[in-house]
Interface confidence: medium
């Protein structure tokens, strides 16, 4: 039977049953937090030949190997991975090996092993029989290899009945467990299976077969199967489905998504049974099972049943996500929220095109409307009363309609409305009048130029800054003395701060009214003395870190067409200095010798600069007598020392020889330091690996159901 | 056309075999599921059970466990029912019907004419 | 095993006129309800699966809806040839089990 779409079997180990009839699993086997131990014994599996996807095992108590549930698991596909994973074992407290001894191919992917504190049988396997490259494997946090005593089927009684293979220059017996060989096939196979009984199988099998050079005996097939044959390609009038099997056409029209239950069915596309069209295509009509390329990005309708979509909180600009065509009208309505502009960006920043007209009032969040970061076109098939398509009203706070250096919107219908809106420059309102079309379309009062404007610097002049000076926390900076037509129109200044990793911030960016805006404000005074140049010192800064700093001269009076006249400067970057490191994180010590000791650590979490070097101190403690208490002759009665709790990876540190003999009397000396290279792989991995974490917990916790 | 074609009536007598057939045609027997239902005389519908085409693995409901056999003719493109020692509960119309190889499609596309 | 019951064994109704039939499952199927049609001549067909999708070839006038245990299956305007017995059939759990059926006739 072939099973699917994905079997997640979590909690309760007596879903195990659901496996029962499986002899493909169509989609990834998952089996994952069962915290009681239990006795798998009883739980076999033998029908199950190929999973086509991936296998995840995380937490699960009391299971100690994978032989006796998946005795002739051959292939994992890898068709969808599990972050790059085809088969992942991830803190699996009680499993002592994999056992898979059947386990022949996977197709695609990498394996990651990792935190199984009594994982062993690990380096007796030869990956490279399994996978066509290894070097994407992670295996770590394991049991080490020293403490397995690892030994394959016949070598205690110096009759060995596993083969041969070399892995890093090690040339040694490969095995699954103490009892188990891992297969390998006769060199006259080259790339293809064998049987048990070491007959080459037919080129399309993959795995292994129950006949050989026979394409109806496969266990699994090498490329697609169809009608009991493994094929190198679809039969014509058949398409590829699911990575590994023939379909015909009234198969793909009559499946039903076991994902969406609200999708429009299966289509076919480039040989394919697939369930929705890929990226860059689109149904050629919604009942078609057959996709055509998009123009630009594939569009997604929405539609309004009340023709009128009121945005009013960051929840109602949750519906949009994804739209690129907006089916009615938008009404904007943002009189507070907690990061607003980025959120609506979100959602609403893939929207191209509003059918109807565009209505933004009361927005006193906004500073800016670039959240509607592609909309290029209002068709204003809907007009307000007065025939507006574009109407802006009492926005105590916008400043900013769009960027129109890099900004093409057109109002194919209607008229503009502009009133009430004390922060927006009438000259922003004209620009966009060129930039969309509708210059002549709107008559006197439809932009107020007297209450448009009426609070902000609408003529700017540009501040230039005169020194920076940095310490490890602050930064000092002056600037030139603003002086407008009348010096009495002055008021002060203010500057605005924020850390800025990259050279790329803009005034505007994440902006709102509400307090998101995420740069820091600090009000300066002017200086009594008319000839000091104005300054600030900022401090309570971090160290070595780049901040983006710019200055606003706030005036007063109403000059030049009732507005009033401003200055400010350009974003100036500029970074702190170094300081002192935070502590390392993470000590473990470990012995690999009777006169070492293994120290290992990672970096502080906060650097404050480019680390060159650390300090380790020690000091000798009084021996502890539990280490006599043991028979280190006897396998099983070696005590777990504290590393192997999958945490650390001992053989990670032992590779490298941490002393080297040096010429002469000199004896051993300090292994070298790491060069930059080693320390900044070092702290990807660590990186990788919080983000693997991360991942895994993401896609596996999920909320019970009611 | 895609259709089921089941073989004609049938009269025996109890403690008798018979062995009603589904030919199919139009689609490739291999690729579909093939199930047998049980319809007695002004009754409802009873699924029986399935076979798997490719395998030729049989799945029997609890109720038709026993007499009832499903086997296959590949080369034939047709499935058989063959029920042993038949009874007086026996009479009734048997439909083959065509389901998809997908766990999320549970249901019964195309249908045999019914064999009584 | 899952029960299904129709509970409307038989109901008449005229051309034209807008025909709902109910189906009822003794535990949640998760939406995997089917409905079939027979003729008086016993030919069977599926008419809708996954309680609301439109088998290929099936007229609109057909329609399906329900959630958890309750189903049903809606004619909007009731023509001659749709003169059938109307069967559900849940696929959420093994053994697939049939309603008891509901036979349209006119009034």
């Known amino acids: 039977e072939i099973c699917g779409p994905g079997i997640d079997i979590r909690n309760d180990y007596q879903q195990l049953k659901r496996l029962e009839n499986c002899t493909v699993i169509e989609g990834y086997l998952h089996i994952l937090l069962i915290s009681k131990a239990e006795d798998y014994r009883s739980y076999r599996f033998p029908k199950l030949t190929v999973i086509t996807e991936y296998l995840l095992l995380f937490r699960v108590a009391g299971l100690e190997s994978l032989g006796d549930l998946f005795p002739n698991l051959t292939v994992i596909r890898g068709w969808k991975l599990f972050y790059n994973y085809a088969l992942v074992i991830f803190e699996m407290t009680n499993l002592k090996d994999i056992g898979l001894y059947n386990l022949r191919n996977i197709t695609r992917g990498a394996i990651r092993i990792e935190k199984n504190a009594d994982l062993c049988y690990l380096s007796t396997v030869d990956w490279s029989l399994i996978l066509d490259a290894v070097s994407n494997n992670y295996i770590v946090g394991n049991k080490p290899p020293k403490e397995c005593g690892d030994l394959c089927p016949g070598t205690m009684e110096e009759k060995p009945m596993c083969e041969k293979t070399t892995i890093n220059n090690e040339y040694n017996y490969r095995c699954w467990t103490t009892n188990r060989c891992q297969k390998m096939c006769p060199s006259t196979c080259g790339k293809r299976a064998c049987t048990e009984n070491n007959e080459c199988c037919h080129p399309e099998c993959l795995g292994s077969c129950s006949a050989p050079d026979n394409d109806t005996a496969c266990v699994a097939c090498r490329h697609y199967y169809y009608a009991g044959v493994c094929v190198p390609a679809c039969p014509p009038n058949t398409y590829r489905f699911e990575g590994w099997r023939c379909v015909d056409r009234d198969f793909c029209a009559n499946i039903l998504s076991a994902e969406s239950s609200d999708s429009e069915g299966f289509v076919i596309h480039d040989g394919e049974c697939m369930q929705e069209c890929p990226s860059g295509f689109i149904r050629n009509g919604s009942q078609s099972m057959y996709c055509i390329p998009c123009e630009g990005p594939c569009p997604k309708v929405c539609e309004e049943e009340k023709k009128t979509k009121t945005i009013d909180s960051v929840t109602s600009a949750q519906m949009l996500q994804g739209c690129t065509i907006f089916k009615g009208n938008l009404l904007i309505n943002i009189r507070r929220g907690n990061n607003i502009a980025s959120e609506l960006e979100n959602f609403m920043g893939l929207i191209e095109v509003v059918t109807g007209y565009v209505k933004i009032r009361h927005s006193h969040a906004l500073v800016s409307l670039s959240f509607l970061k592609n909309l290029r076109l209002i068709l204003g098939e809907e007009q307000l009363e007065g025939n507006y398509s574009f109407y802006v009203l009492d926005n105590q706070n916008l400043q900013q309609l769009w960027d129109w250096d890099h900004r093409n919107l057109t109002i194919k219908a209607g008229k503009m409305y502009f009133a009430f809106n004390p922060k927006l420059c009438v000259s922003e309102i004209y620009r966009m009048e060129e930039v969309t079309g509708t210059k002549g379309r709107q008559s006197k009062g439809d932009i107020n130029t007297r209450n448009n404007g009426e609070r902000a610097s609408c003529e700017s002049d540009v501040l230039h800054f005169t020194s920076t000076t940095t310490s490890k926390n602050r930064i000092i900076i002056t600037w030139h003395r603003y002086r407008p037509p009348d010096y009495r129109d002055l008021i002060s200044f203010t500057v605005y701060y924020k850390e800025a990793p990259f050279k790329n911030v803009t005034e505007y960016d994440g902006q709102d009214a509400c307090g998101s805006n995420s740069w820091n404000m600090v009000d300066v005074d002017l200086p009594p003395n008319k000839d000091v140049e104005p300054g600030i010192l900022l401090h309570g800064l971090k160290p070595w870190t780049q901040y983006a700093v710019y200055v606003k001269a706030v005036t007063l009076t109403m000059v030049e067409n009732d507005h009033i006249r401003g200055a400010k400067s350009e974003i100036l970057y500029i970074r702190t200095n170094a300081s002192v490191p935070s502590i390392p994180l993470d000590v473990l010590s470990a012995s690999n010798s009777s006169s070492q000791l293994i120290v290992k650590w990672n970096p502080p979490s906060l650097p404050n600069g480019n680390l060159s070097y650390y300090i380790v101190r020690w000091q000798r403690q009084p021996q502890d007598g539990y280490l006599y208490r043991h028979n280190y002759c006897s396998k099983d009665k070696i005590p777990i020392r504290k590393y192997a709790d999958g945490t650390i990876d001992i053989e990670e540190v032992t590779e490298n020889p941490k002393t080297e003999v040096c010429g002469g009397e000199k004896g051993p000396c300090c292994a070298c330091p790491k060069t930059e290279a080693e320390k900044q792989a070092e702290k990807e991995e660590a990186e990788y690996r919080k983000v693997f974490e991360n991942f895994l917990h993401n896609s596996i916790f999920v909320p019970r159901p009611e | 056309q895609i259709q089921l074609v089941q073989s004609g009536p049938e009269l025996k007598k109890p403690g008798e075999t018979v062995k009603i057939s589904c030919k199919a045609s139009g689609y490739n027997l291999a690729n579909y599921g093939l199930n047998w239902v049980k319809q007695a005389p002004g009754e409802g519908l009873k699924w029986m059970g399935w076979?798997?085409?490719?395998?030729?693995?049989?799945t029997y409901a609890e109720e038709f466990k026993g007499r009832f056999v499903f086997f296959l003719e590949t080369s034939a493109s047709t499935a058989y029912l063959q029920i042993n020692n038949l009874s007086d509960e026996d009479t009734a119309t048997y439909f083959c019907a065509r389901s998809i190889y997908y766990y999320a499609s549970r249901y019964f596309n195309v249908w045999g004419a019914g064999t009584s | 095993d899952i029960q299904m019951t129709q509970t409307t064994s038989s109901l008449s109704a005229s051309l034209g006129d807008k025909v709902t039939i109910s189906c009822r499952a003794s535990?949640?199927?998760?939406?995997?309800l089917n409905w079939y049609q027979q003729k008086p001549d016993g030919t069977i067909k599926l008419l809708i699966y996954?309680?609301?999708r439109l088998h290929s070839g099936i007229p609109s006038r057909f329609s399906g809806s329900g959630s958890g245990t309750d189903y049903s299956l809606t004619i909007s305007n009731l023509e001659q040839e749709d003169i059938a017995t109307y069967f559900c059939q849940q696929g959420n759990t093994l053994p697939w089990t049939f309603g008891g059926g509901t036979k349209v006739e006119i009034k």
């Open positions: 076979i798997n085409t490719n395998t030729g693995a049989p």
């Open positions: 535990q949640d199927i998760s939406n995997y």
């Open positions: 996954y309680t609301s």
